[in-house]
């Protein structure tokens, strides 16, 4: 029986040109994590393998950095980076656990404008 749960950073926003950390955490299971895949829609961004380490997809090499931990850092964000991101934990013997993060990339001025109205 799969008892684990994935906690994620949930819905997040960042400004164009900036960077963001995508983070998932698997808890409440004794299962052993053997690999974590990071995907954007159906595109593989990166793999963190327990034995072989990190592999970043060639098309994302310039803008994706491994870590911290099992997380993923996206750099030089564009509006096109807006969308769903998934962390897929391959675990023995439970199976796969999937976490979802929605990232919204805002134009710099929109992000700044929004900041003015934040409650201190």
């Amino acid at each position: 029986m799969m008892t684990g749960t994935i906690e994620t950073t949930g819905n997040i926003s960042a400004e164009k040109g900036g960077s963001i950390i995508l983070q998932c955490h698997l808890s409440s299971t004794t299962a052993q994590v053997t690999q974590v895949n990071w995907e954007q829609q159906d595109q593989l961004l990166a793999i963190c393998n327990a034995d072989l380490g990190w592999h970043i997809s060639p098309s994302f090499k310039d803008r994706v950095a491994p870590g911290p931990g099992l997380g993923l850092t996206l750099q030089s964000l564009t509006v096109n980076d807006t969308g769903e991101y998934f962390c897929i934990y391959h675990t023995y013997p439970d199976g796969t656990y999937t976490g979802r993060i929605f990232l919204e990339v805002l134009e710099s001025s929109v992000a700044e404008h929004g900041a003015r109205f934040q409650i201190p």
């Epitope: 029986m1 052993q32 053997t34 690999q35 327990a50 034995d51 023995y92 013997p93």
Partner: antibody, heavy 122, light 107 residues
Framework: QVQLVQSGSDLKKPGASVRVSCKAS????????MNWVRQAPGHGLEWMGW????????TYVQGFTGRFVFSLDTSVNTAYLQISSLKAEDTAVYFC???????????????WGQGTMVTVSS | DIQLTQSPTFLSASVGDRVTITCRAS??????LAWYQQNPGKAPKLLIY???TLQSGVPSRFSGSGSGTEFTLTISSLQPEDFVTYYC?????????FGQGTKVEIK
């Protein structure tokens, strides 16, 4: 090369304890789960459970709780099976086996120890 | 728990024969199934994983197929060293049970 080498066969009296060791070499020990499998004479393979080599957390199959303990010494890349209060029905070959494969659909016991025969007899 | 039933339990065949061993799961296990070969007094050896992927170094006369609840191991042309016991195992969550085994004997 990747291998698991187990301790030698052991003859014990009922009520005694035994410890079987499984030394791994040729790979990163803490990256692959380790399993224990029992095979009684003339019988099939029975999965006893496994130990998370990253956290040291053991999981036991029903029927292998209480008297059976899985442990690790990661400094020497070794997994251990301890059986206490031995009974005649514990007489069997005990295997350690690594879970290979990185993704859920490719898991399998890809490397096995040679087996340790434990005989319990008065 | 998911139970695996292998059939037949015993199989009599001759060198050169094509033989098939079946493994049925009590519930759907996708393709999370492995096949092992065991010689008497030896450790099992992985033949097939993910239902149909041949393990490195295993002769191509061995093949696996199936998904869901029904799986098969086929040996296309039996060799003298193939007259041993075969086990299936599911790896679809805990516990990772084995089938009861199929012993292939010389006719």
């Amino acid at each position: 090369q990747v291998q698991l080498v187990q301790s030698g066969s052991d003859l014990k009296k009922p009520g005694a304890s035994v410890r079987v060791s499984c030394k791994a070499s040729g790979y990163t020990f803490t990256s692959y789960p380790m399993n224990w499998v029992r095979q009684a004479p003339g019988h099939g393979l029975e999965w006893m459970g496994w130990i998370n080599t990253n956290t040291g957390n053991p999981t036991y199959v029903q029927g292998f709780t209480g008297r059976f303990v899985f442990s690790l010494d990661t400094s020497v890349n070794t997994a251990y099976l301890q059986i206490s209060s031995l009974k005649a029905e514990d007489t069997a070959v005990y295997f350690c086996a690594r879970t290979g494969g990185h993704t859920y659909d490719s898991y399998a016991f890809d490397v096995w120890g040679q087996g340790t025969m434990v005989t319990v007899s008065s | 728990d998911i139970q695996l039933t292998q059939s037949p339990t015993f199989l009599s065949a001759s060198v050169g024969d094509r033989v098939t061993i079946t493994c049925r799961a009590s519930q759907v296990i996708s393709s999370s199934l492995a096949w092992y070969q065991q010689n008497p007094g030896k450790a099992p050896k992985l033949l097939i994983y993910a239902a149909s992927t041949l393990q490195s170094g295993v002769p191509s006369r061995f093949s696996g197929s199936g998904s869901g609840t029904e799986f098969t191991l086929t040996i296309s042309s039996l060799q003298p060293e193939d007259f041993v016991t075969y086990y299936c195992q599911h790896l679809h969550g805990y516990p990772c049970n084995f089938g009861q085994g199929t012993k292939v004997e010389i006719k």
